[in-house]
């Protein structure tokens, strides 16, 4: 008795984070024995789509010509071979940006900070939101979440960093969102460059832009300070 068919691989091109209106292609790669591919979307009737394999039959293409809210979500794919259906692929989370207005990201008291001191990144949205995300470019784990606990909505979230070290330096953006869909994000904020200068205690020079994928501030959990606990926002690392 042969074992279960190996699960296919699922991915998106040009990536899994897509701006509203842009095109995206979802690929499902199985085996050369595949006769049909099926794509399922969580919380949608199954199958979400079916495609015949492309030669040499080991993969199928699912095209989204223009990204909209209804395409954002969690997908899995399967393939059918002469012996039956495969195991499901690992999930693909397709995220749409541009669902909400562009937030503003600023650094308090300044984006120029001395090592050992404190800085707070402030993400402000135009309309009340319940989730704020801080992203550091080229970080291994780029997401920092502040999420409202009771659906309470606010116009801003604070991301305190203390004490600041050279690894905090780099380029940050923030997004805002509503908890009803983790797959819908705002437009990205303009980038904010956080520049960490040395001090007497820490004379090492700090790059003005983080170029490594080594640990960044998101790998050093910090308790929210200031107004954040009172605003009902809770921190999550992903």
């Amino acid at each position: 008795q042969a074992g279960p068919l190996p699960k296919p691989t699922l991915w998106a091109e040009p990536g899994s984070v897509i701006s509203w209106g842009n095109s995206v292609t979802i690929w499902c790669q199985g085996t050369l024995e595949a006769r049909e591919y099926r794509l399922d979307k969580e919380e949608s009737p199954a199958p979400w789509d079916r495609q015949n394999p492309l030669e040499p039959k080991n993969k199928a293409r699912f095209s989204i010509p223009s990204m909209t809210e209804d395409y954002a979500g969690r997908y899995r794919c399967y393939y059918r071979s002469p012996v039956g259906w495969s195991q499901p692929s690992d999930p693909l989370e397709l995220v749409m940006t541009g669902a909400y207005s562009k937030p503003t990201l600023s650094a308090l008291p300044s984006p120029l900070v001395t090592s050992g001191k404190s800085v707070t990144l402030l993400c402000q949205s135009r309309s009340p939101m319940d989730t704020f995300l801080l992203i550091k470019e080229r970080a291994a784990h780029p997401l920092l979440h502040l999420r409202s606990e009771h659906g309470a909505q606010q116009h801003q979230a604070e991301f305190p960093m203390s004490p600041v070290t050279s690894v905090h330096g780099g380029t940050y953006r923030c997004f805002s969102s509503h908890g009803f869909s983790h797959y819908l994000l705002s437009h990205p904020s303009d980038p904010l460059e956080l520049i960490v200068s040395g001090s007497l205690e820490d004379p090492r020079p700090s790059p003005t832009r983080s170029v490594s994928t080594a640990a960044g501030p998101e790998d050093q959990p910090l308790m929210p300070t200031g107004s954040v606990p009172h605003s009902g926002l809770r921190r999550h690392w992903e």
């Epitope: 701006s19 509203w20 209106g21 541009g98 909400y100 207005s101 135009r126 009803f180 869909s181 819908l184």
Partner: antibody, heavy 122, light 110 residues
Framework: EVQLVESGGGLVQPGRSMKLSCAAS????????MAWVRQAPTRGLEWVSS????????SYRDSVKGRFTISRDNAKGTLYLQMDSLRSEDTATYYC???????????????WGQGVMVTVSS | DIVLTQSPALAVSLGQRATISCRAS??????????IHWYQQKPGQQPKLLIF???DLASGIPARFSGSGSGTDFTLTINPVQADDIATYYC?????????FGGGTRLELK
């Protein structure tokens, strides 16, 4: 205070063109998605078109697709609507508006200009 | 397109509660959010956003305005009605493209 001032309306013959402008002030124009909404006595309020803050994406209602072009100049703080091949059914007051986002779920209109009248008639 | 139906007019006395309804031809809910929005338009003026996402009060709008409902049936409540509230009220949906408006309800004095 947010201010949106439309201009460029008037009387135009069917098949001809017209360009509306909207001068924005009192907010960071380059951060806001924008839209045009029109209002005709016979058809009520109708969303016409939207554009992202950077001009990178646009959206149109089916009846104006291929005839109208929305654009913006962030340096000037101005939104535009180029209207070609105009029809009598395009007769309406056209409003310039800020929009939460170009995405359908967020196409609600938080600030409105005073509107400009476009009459398409021979 | 999603069609939003509003009754053309509602007569109300000053100081009383006004309830303006809006019915959608299909659900305008997305998860726990209801994608309906309310506007006020006075004669000769542009519309003004009152309520977004069914129940969130827009900036600068007095608390006597409130919104409720889910799925296909929504209500804008004004309590108490003041003379300045005499206007036409429109609902709008953003669940499906294109965004569409109701025909408007004219609020009149009894």
């Amino acid at each position: 205070e947010v201010q949106l001032v439309e201009s460029g309306g008037g009387l135009v013959q069917p098949g001809r063109s017209m360009k509306l402008s909207c001068a924005a002030s009192g907010f960071t124009f380059s951060n806001f998605d924008m839209a045009w909404v029109r209002q005709a006595p016979t058809r009520g309020l109708e969303w016409v078109s939207s554009i992202t803050y950077d001009g990178g994406s646009t959206s149109y209602r089916d009846s104006v697709k291929g005839r109208f072009t929305i654009s913006r100049d962030n340096a000037k703080g101005t939104l535009y609507l180029q209207m070609d091949s105009l029809r009598s059914e395009d007769t309406a007051t056209y409003y310039c508006t800020t929009v939460e986002s170009i995405a359908t779920i967020s196409t609600y209109f938080d600030y409105w200009g005073q509107g400009v009248m476009v009459t398409v008639s021979s | 397109d999603i069609v939003l139906t509003q009754s053309p007019a509602l007569a109300v006395s000053l100081g009383q509660r006004a309830t303006i309804s809006c019915r959608a031809s299909q659900s305008v809910s997305m998860s726990r959010y209801d994608l309906i929005h309310w506007y006020q338009q006075k004669p000769g003026q542009q519309p003004k956003l009152l309520i977004f996402r069914a129940s969130d009060l827009a900036s600068g709008i007095p608390a006597r305005f409130s919104g409720s409902g889910s799925g296909t049936d929504f209500t804008l409540t004004i309590n108490p009605v003041q003379a300045d509230d005499i206007a036409t009220y429109y609902c709008q949906q953003t669940r499906k493209s294109p965004p569409t408006f109701g025909g408007g309800t004219r609020l009149e004095l009894k």
